[in-house]
């Protein structure tokens, strides 16, 4: 068993038909030493009486809020939450996996740039009584600060028969240096509770691994005279990180008819111009990656070629 | 050439063959995702590499105020990562494919690093693995770790170059 | 070609060393590693220890460790191994071989210890 | 030191016959696994490398089978000029150790 926060209590299960469960001693936040009786949740059963009780808990039914009282006056609160194990493993049933890049992925997280901020999300069907905390920190012998902010809702979607929701937060380290070879990385935990079920989910990574620019801004085409050919012009987004003689990016520019069948054509420059030619019903969508390191590729940004 | 007395590299020929590097670093491993194997037992071969850290100056205001601390730097990693090239993490079984883009990248460290500091002169303070012989079976591990530590290497020593290339091209 | 090419025949008395070369042509010579091992009459195969030409390195079997010395010269692409304090049960077919699993392996050398 | 125990010994075996020699090693070692076939007065020959990978040259009727501690080499119809000495050969870890070997004869 361990404190989670004040007043509230993770008790670690074994779980499996029989198991003989975790004994738990409670003890009551008061000078009183006597005329203490305990009770859970909303009943008002006694389950025993004095300033300690000690408890088998076996099964959700034995989680949930202690309160020891006197005389019809609240001492105090203990929230005693189960987190289950299995054949050797902790439970994920809060979040879904969402299986990319690989398979037990619960926490995905993007950087638009190195200062050091990023994203991080996680998906669930669950959608009451279910509350998330989320710390971090850069290594885990010696952390160095990152501060999250509180986790919002912040997509939902059906799937389905099933509602999705999506959960975001923010973090920022706090001491970022943008132009280092990070040599310790990222970790996220995020601790979630569902009912009287404690879960909690970890991600470490570079920031250099998670980075995906946004999209190529100001994307304009200008034609060159008695020629099919376009100059496809566009500018860096202004969330990267600058100066762009040292972050510098790499583009693709795509030719895109109509139809999906239609072949695309496809050239990639450093350059934030390129010459295309332009079929009729087409688009030119123009995306972003890191030019030294391989992370993701921005979204497209496109215009129409007519 | 970046002489250790202080005169400037040839930043553009930096430039080109750190950008190539970039490319060799990403083509000897590429990558779907950024496949994890970080858990996996930290070598101390991969533990002890050389970073380019926050102290270095080779961020953008360090460059311009001395280039040579983070120069020194980058030629300290791109020695050490040379000698790990061609140790018998690479060489030995299981054996590369005869075209696999790991000679060249070897061969491009080698090259930038002379570019850097020609025969004759030297920075002090070599940082060299000192390397025990690897079994065959750790083998397919360590290098996936050095790969993947010098791709972040590399990266960084490209910013430099081209950033150098750019602003402080005589 | 790519191959591997061996010293000739030796005769040694019990005592004395024997230096075998193996010339290596074909392939960069130090992007592999170079293995040398024994056969004696009738028996099979024991590995006796193995260099990294670019380095230098070497790794050697425990049983043959303070006997056996390799080494390789890589302005001429070519390993050595010297066996010292030669008995009579030293006799045998000394082989350089590249990474095993290249499967290039040099003819072999015959060496003799006989008083 | 990771042993390697080859079986059987010695076989005999006609022209066009399956043939099947095992080896078996002391601890894991995953594929890190050779075959080489000899002939008297001539170097070690290459046939299957990562246990199961067919070195380049060498005639499909060999092939490799096995991972961890148990391998098998089978020649799926024998030939003439397959008669000689198999060695199986592991390369996990130093010290690199063969097996005793096979001898594989006309019956």
């Known amino acids: 068993i361990w404190e989670l926060k004040k007043d509230v209590y993770v008790v670690e299960l074994d779980w499996y038909p029989d198991a003989p469960g975790e004994m738990v001693v409670l003890t009551c936040d008061t000078p009183e030493e006597d005329g203490i009786t305990w009770t859970l949740d909303q009943s008002s059963e006694v389950l025993g009486s004095g300033k300690t009780l000690t408890i088998q808990v076996k099964e959700f039914g034995d989680a949930g809020q202690y309160t020891c009282h006197k005389g019809g006056e609240v001492l105090s609160h203990s929230l005693l939450l189960l987190h289950k194990k299995e054949d050797g493993i902790w439970s994920t049933d809060i979040l879904k996996d969402q299986k990319e890049p690989k398979n037990k992925t619960f926490l995905r997280c993007e950087a638009k740039n190195y200062s050091g901020r990023f994203t991080c999300w996680w998906l669930t069907t669950i959608s009451t009584d279910l509350t998330f905390s989320v710390k971090s920190s850069r290594g885990s012998s010696d952390p160095q600060g990152v501060t999250c902010g509180a986790a919002t809702l912040s997509a939902e979607r059906v799937r389905g028969d099933n509602k999705e929701y999506e959960y975001s937060v923010e973090c920022q380290e706090d001491s970022a240096c943008p132009a280092a070879e990070e040599s310790l990385p990222i970790e996220v935990m995020v601790d979630a509770v569902h009912k009287l079920k404690y879960e909690n989910y970890t991600s470490s990574f570079f920031i250099r691994d998670i980075i995906k620019p946004d999209p190529p801004k100001n994307l304009q085409l200008k034609p060159l005279k008695n020629s099919r050919q376009v100059e496809v012009s566009w500018e860096y987004p202004d969330t990267w990180s600058t100066p762009h003689s040292y972050f510098s990016l790499t583009f693709c520019v795509q030719v895109q008819g109509k139809s999906k069948r239609e072949k695309k054509d496809r050239v990639f420059t450093d350059k934030t111009s390129a010459t295309v030619i332009c079929r009729k019903n087409a688009s030119i969508s123009v995306r972003a990656q890191d030019r030294y390191y391989s992370s993701s590729w921005s979204e497209w940004a496109s215009v129409p070629c007519s | 050439r970046a002489v250790p007395g202080g005169s400037s590299p040839a930043w553009t020929q930096c430039q080109q063959l750190s950008q190539k590097l970039c490319t060799l670093a990403w083509s000897a491993h590429p990558l779907v995702g950024h496949m994890d194997l970080r858990e996996e037992g930290d070598e101390e071969t991969t533990n002890d590499v050389p970073h380019i850290q926050c102290g270095d100056g080779c961020d953008p205001q360090g460059l311009r105020d001395n280039s040579q601390f983070c120069l020194q730097r980058i030629h300290q990693g791109l020695i050490f990562y040379e000698k790990l090239l061609g140790s018998d993490i690479f060489t030995g079984e299981p054996s590369l494919l005869p075209d696999s883009p790991v000679g060249q990248l070897h061969a491009s460290l080698l090259g930038l690093s002379q570019l850097l500091q020609p025969e004759g002169h030297h920075w002090e303070t070599q940082q060299i693995p000192s390397l025990s012989p690897s079994q065959p079976w750790q083998r397919l591990l360590l290098r996936f770790k050095i790969l993947r530590s010098l791709q972040a290497f590399v990266a960084v020593a490209a910013r430099v170059f081209a950033h150098g290339a750019a602003t402080l091209s005589p | 070609q790519v191959q591997l090419v061996q010293s000739g025949a030796e005769v040694k008395k019990p005592g004395s060393s024997v230096k075998v070369s193996c010339k290596a042509s074909?392939?960069?010579?130090?992007?592999?590693?170079m293995h040398w091992v024994r056969q004696a009459p009738g028996q099979g195969l024991e590995w006796m220890g193995y260099i990294n030409p670019y380095n230098d390195g070497t790794n050697y079997n425990e049983k043959f460790k303070g006997r056996v010395t390799i080494t390789a010269d890589k302005s001429t692409s070519t390993a050595y191994m010297e066996l010292s304090s030669l008995r009579s049960e030293d006799t045998a077919v000394y082989y350089c071989?590249?990474?095993?699993?290249?499967?290039?392996w040099g003819q072999g050398t015959t060496v003799t210890v006989s008083s | 030191d990771i042993q390697m125990t080859q079986s059987p010994s010695s076989l005999s075996a006609s022209v066009g016959d399956r043939v099947t020699i095992t080896c078996k090693a002391s601890?894991?070692?995953?594929?890190?696994l050779t075959w080489y076939q000899q002939k008297p007065g001539k170097a070690p020959k290459l046939l299957i490398y990562?246990?199961?990978s067919l070195e380049t040259g060498v005639p499909s009727r060999f092939s490799g089978s096995g991972s961890g501690t148990d391998f098998t080499l089978t020649i799926s119809s024998l030939q003439p000029e397959d008669f000689a000495t198999y060695y199986c050969q592991m390369y996990w870890s130093t010290p690199f150790t063969f097996g005793g070997g096979t001898k594989v004869e006309i019956k």
């Open positions: 071989a590249r990474n095993w699993d290249t499967g290039l």
């Open positions: 990562g246990a199961t």
């Open positions: 074909g392939y960069k010579f130090t992007r592999y590693v």
């Open positions: 601890d894991h070692i995953l594929k890190f």
